[in-house]
Interface confidence: low
């Protein structure tokens, strides 16, 4: 069978010898000269010659990939003695590898774009594109502004995907100061091999003319965004802060303020249309919503079409207005033969408030249950508490269920507390402490959970 890989050849070869392409080889070839290799197809015998004894192929001329990137040839191996082929005729490909031998070229010498004076820095105002007959890295183009009165007012960014130059605004424009700018933009190849520098400068330039359009500008807020904060216990009509906006045009038209009601559907906030003061129109609750993100609009009174918007982030500050409560519904059991001071349940609490230094809950039995209780509460001082047995042995026939009222306090200001009830069922257990028989309900609800009352 034939043995070769695809052949690759560099274009624009400048060596004095013929350029070596590769070797055709049949595994029937024993190296005794009995086989003859024949080449046919694209450029065979002219562009490409083969050593009929060894199968070595050479290119006789300088090739240009931009003229023809691929050559398709056919190979034969013939037994010299019999004249018969020892391999079926087979097709192979010679691919011409690109070098950077073509410069970028602008299809036109002048471009013109227009942009409103209100275009912020970074705004794209037009695209220009040079073409390059090379491929891949050799066809990559970099654009730069090399000269012109707009040198410091505009930038050109190279779009790596499209290989276009995007002209962008660099500094704020002013129609009253200057209406037309002229730039010289250059397109160049960033990757140029030093050995091919003789082929040319690998760049081209074009003139770009930019016309600035006059704009009646909308009001401008003093900040890009406002962050305000208010306590959740604020009364209605409490002022939170204010926004200010000005008409940047020479006319300095007066402005009026309003809240975009799409961003405040519940009408929680209001604004003084004259001075921009923000105040509450409803009571707040941090636990319902921590941040209110609303938009304020400033509109020119003389020209309502000219308006601007600014985001307002209002943070509601926590006030201790929620009582802690059990994290779960606690229903547990105690063995009849339990010893005193055994831990039978750990209690956890939650609180919707968010104190600065974290929660510090305390747990205790409600006063009415504290004396003579069969159980004690041990406050672990880590926002948990344990229920401990207080005596040796319980009789489920005497008392099958105990309801323990537990007071949870948050120790914040003002102090908030609630009472939750823990249900303790008395059960018969084996000597390992495993529950054997119990009040029916305890088996139906094995330690499942919700808030204690």
């Amino acid at each position: 069978s034939w043995m070769w890989n695809q052949f690759f050849l560099l274009e624009e070869y400048t060596g004095s010898d013929y350029q070596y392409v590769g070797k055709l080889h049949s595994d029937q070839d024993r190296g005794d000269g009995s086989l003859k290799y024949i080449l046919s197809g694209d450029g065979a015998g002219d562009l490409f010659i083969i050593n009929e004894n060894t199968g070595d192929i050479q290119a006789t001329k300088r090739l240009d990939r931009e003229e023809k990137p691929v050559y398709i040839l056919r190979a034969q191996a013939i037994n010299r003695r019999t004249g018969r082929p020892v391999e079926p005729e087979s097709e192979f490909i010679i691919k011409i590898h690109d070098i950077n031998d073509n410069e970028p070229i602008f299809p036109q010498s002048t471009y013109q774009f227009k942009t409103p004076e209100s275009s912020p820095p970074g705004t794209p105002i037009g695209r220009i594109k040079a073409s390059d007959a090379d491929v891949g890295e050799n066809a990559e183009i970099e654009y730069s502004i090399t000269d012109g009165e707009g040198l410091d007012m505009f930038d050109v960014i190279t779009d790596q995907e499209t290989q276009e130059g995007i002209i962008t605004v660099k500094k704020l424009l002013d129609f009253e100061k200057k209406k037309v700018y002229t730039l010289k933009v250059e397109a160049s190849n960033p990757y140029v091999e030093p050995r091919f520098l003789y082929l040319g400068p690998f760049k081209d330039s074009a003139t770009v003319r930019i016309v600035v359009e006059d704009v009646d500008e909308p009001p401008v807020f003093s900040k890009l965004a406002y962050i305000l904060q208010i306590r959740e216990d604020a009364q209605i009509n409490t002022t939170i802060g204010s926004v200010t906006a000005q008409d940047p045009d020479a006319a300095r038209n007066p402005v009026k303020y309003s809240v975009d009601r799409h961003t405040d559907m519940d009408r929680i906030f209001n604004i003084d249309s004259g001075n921009g003061s923000i105040f509450t129109s409803k009571l707040l609750d941090r636990e319902t919503l921590l941040w209110h993100n609303i938009t304020v609009i400033a509109t020119e009174i003389n020209n309502p079409k000219q308006s601007s918007r600014v985001p307002l982030y209002i943070k509601v500050l926590d006030v201790n207005d929620n009582a802690p409560e059990f994290a779960e519904f606690y229903e547990t059991f105690v063995c009849e033969k339990a010893k005193a001071d055994q831990l039978i349940q750990t209690l956890h609490a939650v609180d919707k408030d968010d104190p600065y230094s974290g929660h510090q809950f305390s747990f205790s039995l409600a006063p009415e249950a504290a004396s003579g209780s069969n159980f004690t509460i041990q406050d672990n001082k880590d926002n948990t508490a344990g229920i401990l047995t207080r005596k040796n042995g319980y009789n489920r026939h005497e008392m099958s269920t105990y309801l323990l009222p537990v007071v949870i306090s948050d120790n914040d200001y003002p102090v908030q507390s609630s009472t939750g009830t823990v249900t303790v069922r008395v059960c018969a257990c084996d000597h390992h402490g495993n529950m054997q028989s119990c009040h029916a309900e305890a088996l139906i609800h094995p330690t499942g959970l919700s808030t204690g009352a």
Epitope: K223, L224, A225, Y226, I227, L290, S357, G358, D382
Partner: antibody
Framework: EVQLVQSGAEVKKPGASVKVSCKAS????????MHWVRQAPGQGLEWMGW????????EYNQKFQGRVTITADRSTSTAYMELSSLRSEDTAVYFC???????????????WGQGTLVTVSS | DIQMTQSPSSLSASVGDRVTITCKAS??????LAWYQQKLGEGPKLLIY???TLQTGVPSRFSGSGSGTDFTLTISSLQPEDFATYYC????????FGQGTKVEIK
């Protein structure tokens, strides 16, 4: 993608001031806290302070209070940290880091600058 | 102020080893803890936040656990690129870092 590019290394004399810059790109500069953290040679990390570029509000580590000033230029999306009355123990690499808003000023830091070495030597 | 204590301060391990670094807070910080990796001459890189959430793009061999005062960073199978210094950081009240754990090649 998010990038924080810091200014180059500085050599200062004791008593002088240094101002390090941190240019942000790839996100809305005004909407995230920018923190400054330093690392003395062979040492751990030490938080210095933050700025919220949206309104210029700052908070500083008590240790540096009065010596450090953090500012931000919204037009160039650049944050600055200036440290005055330099002493030899201020020799460190100074990092800017973007804070992820997590209910308070910045939570953890998801992107860091490459660091700026400040050497204080007479 | 909250102090963060990391241990060990350094450790030697081989590629493929399971590595565990611990971090202890001087008070309850709930889950407000992040882990960072720092290589020589570079800025730190976020690995884990909120004690156990993996940052986007970080390999799954890194994991975090813990809550309250005790936290752990685990590298399930150490890779050559994991040799670095690791820091924990609390962001519950202010910002404080552990002193770092240097993971070296055995």
């Amino acid at each position: 993608e998010v990038q924080l590019v810091q200014s180059g290394a500085e050599v200062k004399k004791p008593g002088a001031s240094v101002k390090v810059s941190c240019k942000a790109s790839g996100y809305t500069f005004t909407r995230n806290f920018m923190h400054w953290v330093r690392q003395a040679p062979g040492q751990g990390l030490e938080w210095m302070g933050w700025i919220y570029p949206g309104d210029g509000e700052t908070e500083y580590n008590q240790k540096f209070q009065g010596r450090v000033t953090i500012t931000a230029d919204r037009s160039t999306s650049t944050a600055y940290m200036e440290l005055s009355s330099l002493r030899s123990e201020d020799t460190a690499v100074y990092f800017c880091a973007r804070g992820v808003y997590g209910g308070f000023a910045g939570g953890y830091f998801d992107f860091w600058g490459q660091g700026t070495l400040v050497t204080v030597s007479s | 102020d909250i102090q963060m204590t990391q241990s060990p301060s350094s450790l030697s391990a081989s590629v493929g080893d399971r590595v565990t670094i611990t971090c202890k807070a001087s008070q309850n910080i709930y889950k407000n803890l992040a882990w960072y990796q720092q290589k020589l001459g570079e800025g730190p890189k976020l690995l884990i936040y909120d004690a156990n959430t993996l940052q986007t793009g970080v390999p799954s061999r890194f994991s975090g656990s813990g809550s309250g005062t005790d936290f752990t960073l685990t590298i399930s199978s150490l890779q050559p690129e994991d040799f670095a210094t690791y820091y924990c950081q609390q962001y519950y009240s202010g910002w404080a870092f552990g002193q770092g754990t240097k993971v070296e090649i055995k």
